[in-house]
């Protein structure tokens, strides 16, 4: 996935006494927060695996790539990165694995250049609808975000609020239509059971969508029609049983698409006929010869591409008078 990377060598590490001595003053141009490593040449600050409980206040103004991974941040409040002068250069922010369970409205405000954000591997029980849009206006100022990485952000079952996790995430993605420019969205490993039907229509710039390793059973109510720029759609490791005609036609109509469907429990009965016909003709499915039946038992491991209509039967439904109890 796309996390901020660094070409940095020559990191400088500040002494803790220096940071505390100047913490009340505006940051010096070349200052490095305590427990962080900084490279001005690479415009990179790394505060990694330091058990930080809050975002350092004295981040250098030059920072372009900020790694705050492996910490214990718990809550990201409004304006968590608001500074005077603002962090105008910050383009890539990685907060993965930092024990975040709450991201509040406006957490990423005042970051005019923020293009990549990675919140993966945080148990986000409370993601504000306005976490990315910053305001509750029906139409917000466009967010500069181009890549949003939200893999494995589902909290443990007992920590979830009494609401749909899918709904909470989607509300944050759609609020104020702020993410119209988003090109990459990764939502892997989140136990999603369904995809709310309106989400994709409002993210028209998407090039890459990763929904792998969820629990999606069906795409019947999901429309891909508006995603004319979509280049990759990852649906591996879900619970998909079959793709129906409407979905197949929409996928086929996307000019640049590559679809990944491996490791789904395909049900090879009469309802699979259209999908098999489509698979034989389409070029959009990557590794299509690796798709195999999971059910019924007599079809297990059969390669979908090698099936014909005679193989795909449905047991007849007996009239009630003929059914055994």
């Amino acid at each position: 996935s796309s996390s901020p990377t660094s070409s940095a060598s020559s990191f400088s590490s500040s002494a803790p006494f220096l940071a505390s001595a100047v913490s009340a003053q505006p940051p010096l141009p070349d200052q490095c927060p305590a427990l962080c490593e900084c490279s001005e040449a690479a415009r990179t600050v790394k505060c990694v695996n330091r058990n930080l409980t809050e975002v350092p206040t004295d981040l250098p103004a030059y920072v372009r790539n900020l790694f705050l991974t492996g910490n214990q941040l718990a809550v990201l409040p409004a304006g968590a990165f608001a500074r005077r002068p603002p962090l105008a250069e910050l383009a890539a922010l990685n907060l993965s694995g930092s024990r975040l369970d709450e991201v509040r409205a406006g957490a990423f405000e005042h970051l005019p250049s923020l293009r990549q954000l990675d919140l993966s591997h945080n148990p986000l029980a409370d993601l504000s609808p306005f976490a990315f849009s910053g305001s509750n206006a029906s139409v917000s100022a466009p967010s500069p975000l181009v890549e949003l990485i939200l893999n494995h952000i589902v909290p443990p079952e007992d920590e979830r609020q009494n609401r749909s996790f899918e709904g909470m995430v989607v509300a944050a993605l759609l609020a104020g239509r702020a993410l119209q420019g988003l090109r990459r969205l990764e939502l892997a490993s989140n136990h999603f059971l369904y995809l709310p039907r309106d989400v994709l229509a409002q993210l028209p710039s998407l090039r890459h969508l990763d929904l792998s390793n969820n629990s999606l059973v069906s795409l019947t109510y999901v429309s891909f029609r508006n995603l004319t720029h979509l280049e990759s759609l990852h649906l591996e490791d879900n619970a998909l049983k079959v793709l129906h005609n409407g979905t197949l036609a929409e996928l086929q109509g996307l000019p640049h698409i590559r679809v990944f469907l491996d490791n789904n429990p395909w049900v090879c009965d009469c309802h699979m006929a259209d999908m098999v016909t489509w698979l034989k003709e389409t070029e959009v499915v990557q590794g299509k010869d690796r798709l195999t039946c999971a059910y019924p038992e007599k079809m297990r491991n059969r390669v979908l591409l090698e099936l014909n209509s005679a193989d795909l039967d449905c047991d007849p439904i007996l009239p009630p008078s003929l059914q055994t109890s």
Partner: antibody, heavy 116, light 107 residues
Amino acid sequence: QVQLQQSGAELMKPGASMRLSCKATGYTFTGYWLEWIKRRPGHGLEWIGEILPGRGSTNYNEKFKGKATFTAETSSNTAYMQLTSLTTEDSAIYYCARGGRDFDNWGQGTTLTVSS
Amino acid sequence: DIQMTQSTSSLSASLGDRVTISCSASQGINNHLNWYQQKPDGTVKLLIYYTSSLHSGVPSRFSGSGSGTDYSLTISNLEPEDIAIYYCQQFSKLPYTFGGGTKVEMK
């Protein structure tokens, strides 16, 4: 019922090449992946790779690329594995198995001994 | 490649014992795990597929469980014919990989 019958034991010289065969009966040969697995004492089982006979598609374990080559003859329902530039490390029992997500039927294995 | 580790290479048990064999993956494999039995004569059979599904013809004393990276095979009531080497195998990602095997012997 499904059966996979493998060719008999072989004694080969280092540097030689050889071809093992696996004849499938009792199922649609072209409809399933056919796997090849190596077993050596102290090394357990190693997946070499697989072939989809109807299409000739193959997947190889990187470790065996250049060592093993898979082919299949659909007219006789037989899969083959060619092993080249044999060394003593290639001495093992080689299995074919009907594959996919699990290997539900296995051949009896072919013992290959490489010795000068 | 995903590494599969069977921490116990051999174990001894008595007839009728409950035997549990463990297997761990170097990363999450999403229940994409199978168990095989290799008899002393070299024959290999599938016992359990997709973590917990019993392959047809396999006695019900065999069962599988697990999730994420940790999986196990249980023989609830050991019989003489269960003397064998047991292998786990992941099919989450190519290349498919096997554990090193656990040899079950009679006390």
